[in-house]
């Protein structure tokens, strides 16, 4: 397994609306082909896989039918939009990607973007 | 190389507790998660609950919760693992383990494995 | 919690023979995460990330899968092969592992 560099923003807030967008960019060594990306988010010690993809360079990436992730990728950028975030998503959010093919196998994890979710507040009831 | 070095097997009364411990060497211990996993006889394997030793933060299994107390003494790199309120349902191997590298390679490293064993 | 079934419970495989190993999940993960266990000893990690095999294990095994099944694969099953196999999830806590499934040789 080879390293490879990964970078993303530090800190990114989330739209009232609960989603957040950030780019993961890597630092390709070679001509890959297949490229994975995945989101981690670390909370304390809690580590969980959010959501990943796999895409064939040039092409746009598929996450799952019902993942909270959705993204597009233009050269070495991947561009990040997870959505249904609530405050108790706030959290360290990982970016780690993989060179799948072809060989040899690169591996790159990025230092983390935080992002911070901010429920909104209810409307006030108002009379008319 | 690392390592993660457990206490030996431990016989125990019902209703009594038992704290087994988990040498971390060969690594910053501070780097990584220590989780801790239970594997009854003749049964798969149950995850109890892990600690982030640098925060010293917990996160544990709804089914272990009031059963296994997670620490860590970061001076001897050291995790532990403490059982309370023992019965025969607790008679298990209990591991330790860490992740490989940061983030990726889940539970690369184990312990041997402490036997627990409760009995009057 | 998410539920990792496996199947079959335990399966009897003549050395040479191809085997397969399904886990499936109660809901969908991202990944799926496959152990190996001998009597007596520890669990080692076998193939993480659904399809990345561990240090030292024999391009014979293969992950494959995504959602909810996913699948460990033994091109040609070796006697060093016998143990029991366990998936594990990593998408939501708690952590959960599989029910295990024992391979034996004939």
């Known amino acids: 397994c080879k390293a490879m560099h990964v970078a993303q923003p530090a800190v990114v807030l989330a739209s009232s609306r609960g989603i957040a967008s950030f780019v993961c960019e890597y630092a390709s060594p070679g001509k890959a082909t297949e490229v994975r990306v995945t989101v981690l988010r670390q909370a304390d010690s809690q580590v969980t896989e959010v959501c990943a993809a796999t895409y064939m360079m040039g092409n746009e990436l598929t996450f799952l039918d019902d993942s909270i992730c959705t993204g597009t990728s233009s050269g070495n950028q991947v561009n990040l939009t997870i959505q249904g975030l609530r405050a108790m998503d706030t959290g360290l959010y990982i970016c780690k990607v993989e060179l799948m093919y072809p060989p040899p196998y690169y591996l790159g994890i990025g230092n983390g973007t935080q992002i911070y979710v901010i429920d909104p507040e209810p409307c006030p009831d108002s009379d008319f | 190389e690392v390592q993660l070095q457990q206490s030996g097997a431990e016989v125990k009364k019902p209703g009594a507790s038992v704290k087994v411990s988990c040498k971390a060497s060969g690594y910053t211990f501070t780097d990584y998660n220590m989780d801790w996993v239970r594997q009854a006889p003749g049964a798969s394997l149950d995850w109890i609950g892990n600690?982030?030793?640098?925060?010293?933060?917990?996160s544990y299994n709804q089914k272990f919760k009031g059963k296994a107390t997670l620490t860590v003494d970061k001076s001897t790199s050291t995790a532990y693992m403490e059982l309370r309120s023992l019965t025969a349902g607790d008679i298990a191997v209990y591991y330790c383990?860490?992740?490989?590298?940061?983030?990726?390679?889940?539970?690369?490293?184990w312990g041997q494995g402490t036997l627990v064993t409760v009995s009057s | 919690q998410i539920v990792l079934t496996q199947t079959p419970l335990s399966l009897s495989v003549s050395p040479g023979e191809p085997a397969s190993i399904s886990c499936s999940a109660s809901s969908s993960v991202t990944y799926m995460h496959w152990f190996q266990q001998k009597p007596g000893q520890s669990p080692k990690s076998w193939i993480y990330?659904?399809?990345i095999l561990a240090s030292g294990v024999p391009d014979r095994f293969s992950g494959s899968g995504s959602g909810t099944d996913f699948t460990l694969k033994i091109s040609r099953v070796e006697a060093d092969d016998a143990g029991v196999y366990y998936c594990q999830q990593r998408t939501s806590y708690p952590l959960t592992f599989g029910t295990g499934t024992k391979l034996e040789l004939k």
């Open positions: 383990t860490r992740d490989g590298n940061r983030y990726d390679a889940w539970f690369a490293y």
């Open positions: 600690i982030n030793p640098n925060s010293e933060s917990t």
């Open positions: 990330s659904t399809s």
